[in-house]
């Protein structure tokens, strides 16, 4: 019995469906196949769990998170044992392993190996200012989404016909952060925060209002 | 309460210039967090943002429109103002000016808006 | 051609529960919040539903507003004749860097 080599990894988006490949040959008639499929979630490493089982001409269900959601490719006893696995969840981030028995048929490589990763787009950010608006104050403009995954990059942009940022301020686009020094009238404006990452995109918007100083009457 | 007007010609010539301007009043143009607005609406069409200027005389356009359009404002008048060249039958609408603001939203909203005046290009 | 697409025309009869939809992309209503306007006959548009689902003060409960995934829907129940509009859903789009606005949805009370 000979397991085929799989891709080293899937990715999916949250919420769509994944195939995990499994496929083998084998020397003997299928009366007696045997597959289990095992996961070891990303999330918690030492608590691998049953996905789903094909025993004795019958299959049976894996972790109760799995139910409803998962099932064979095709009709079973067959050399493709590949599952899918539908609404796929963050939870569901793992290495997967089939393996297979076909009895009297021993010897060889009996187990599969596919990781799956369930990518996610970022979250609507949140855009906040730090720092006194005051004019010649040092300000930070703040962008994070509380989710996605790769990790998502920002970019900010001023909203007028430039797109660029006032000259003064300097961007990470790792952190999200702008850091705008001593800001002036021309700082005032909106501000739009893009985070993305391989799925998709995001925003928000920031409205910056510079405060003049008031001048003061001489009495 | 804000309140905004448009005006200006309602007839104009193709190849020349669209001027409309909206008046606001109720509230100062340079109270800080709002953003003059242009829209339109072709006939039996749906709206289309033409772009916004700032009280600072900041300005950001539609990247389809950007080369015919000019927002400008006067703040001594409590008054925005919209340029269009190069006009075309395409640009027959009515055009609402309106008032833009974010408040807690992550990207704000339109409100309120002016009654709006046809501009028709003909020759 | 309007970013957002929007059924042309919808109707019903009094005490109805009539939905409008709003269908857009990734880069509008899927990572955007969503506004609701209605233009009653002759007059401008005016803000009915704001980030999603809030009411502004003056707009009747009877008006709701959801969305989910690229898309967005404007729920009007116990409707009456005063609902008879026009009605247009707006987002802000990511990769224009600018509001883009429906078709606009003819709502008709029958």
């Known amino acids: 019995l000979e397991v085929s080599e799989s891709p080293g990894s899937i990715q999916v988006a949250r919420g769509q469906p994944a195939v995990l490949p499994c496929t083998f040959t084998t020397s003997a008639a299928l009366i007696n196949l045997n597959v289990i499929w095992m996961v070891t979630p990303l999330s918690n490493a030492n608590q691998p769990e049953q996905v789903i089982l094909y025993q004795g001409g019958q299959m049976f269900d894996g972790a109760p998170r799995f139910h409803g959601r998962v099932g064979f490719t095709g009709t079973m006893p067959a050399t493709n044992v590949s599952i899918f696995i539908n609404n796929t969840q963050l939870s569901d981030t793992g290495t997967y392993q089939c393996l297979v028995n076909n009895l009297p048929d021993i010897g060889g490589r009996n187990i599969g190996v596919t990781g799956l990763t369930v990518l996610v787009p970022p979250s609507a950010p949140h855009c906040q200012i730090q720092g006194s608006q005051d004019i010649g104050s040092d300000v930070i403009l703040l962008c994070s989404s509380e989710e996605g995954i790769p990790r998502p990059t920002y970019l900010w942009e001023k909203l007028d016909n430039t797109l660029k940022l006032p000259p003064t301020a300097t961007q990470d686009q790792v952190q999200g952060t702008v850091t705008i020094r001593n800001i002036s009238a021309l700082s005032s404006g909106l501000y739009q925060c893009v985070a993305s990452n391989a799925i998709g995109t995001s925003t928000c918007l920031l409205d910056l209002q510079v405060i003049s100083p008031q001048p003061r009457n001489i009495g | 309460q804000v309140q905004l007007q448009e005006s200006g010609p309602g007839l104009v010539k193709p190849s020349q210039t669209l001027s409309l301007t909206c008046t606001v009043s109720?509230?100062?143009?340079?109270?800080?967090?709002?953003?003059w607005s242009w829209i339109r609406q072709h006939p039996g069409k749906g709206l289309e943002w033409i772009g916004y200027i700032y009280y600072s005389g900041s300005t950001y356009y539609n990247p389809s429109l950007k080369s015919r359009v000019t927002i400008s404002v006067d703040t001594s008048k409590n008054q925005f103002s919209l340029k269009l060249s190069s006009v075309t039958a395409a640009d027959t609408a009515v055009y609402y000016c309106?008032?833009?603001?974010?408040?807690?939203?992550?990207?704000?909203?339109?409100?309120?808006w002016g009654q709006g005046t046809l501009v028709t290009v003909s020759s | 051609q309007s970013v957002l697409t929007q059924p042309p025309s919808a109707s019903g009869t009094p005490g109805q529960r009539v939905t409008i939809s709003c269908s857009g992309s990734?880069?509008?209503?899927?990572?955007?919040?969503v506004n609701w306007y209605q233009q009653l006959p002759g007059t401008a548009p005016k803000l009915l539903i704001s980030?999603?689902?809030n009411r502004p003060s003056g707009v009747p409960d009877r008006f709701s507003g959801s969305k989910s995934g690229t898309s967005a829907s404007l729920a009007i129940t116990g409707l009456q004749a005063e609902d008879e509009a026009d009605y247009y859903c707006q987002s802000y789009d990511s990769n224009l860097s600018g509001w883009v606005f429906g078709g606009g949805t003819k709502l008709t009370v029958l």
């Open positions: 109720g509230g100062s143009i340079s109270s800080g967090g709002y953003y």
């Open positions: 990734s880069s509008n209503i899927g990572s955007n919040t």
């Open positions: 980030d999603n689902n």
């Open positions: 309106a008032s833009w603001s974010l408040g807690t939203s992550n990207h704000g909203w339109f409100d309120p």
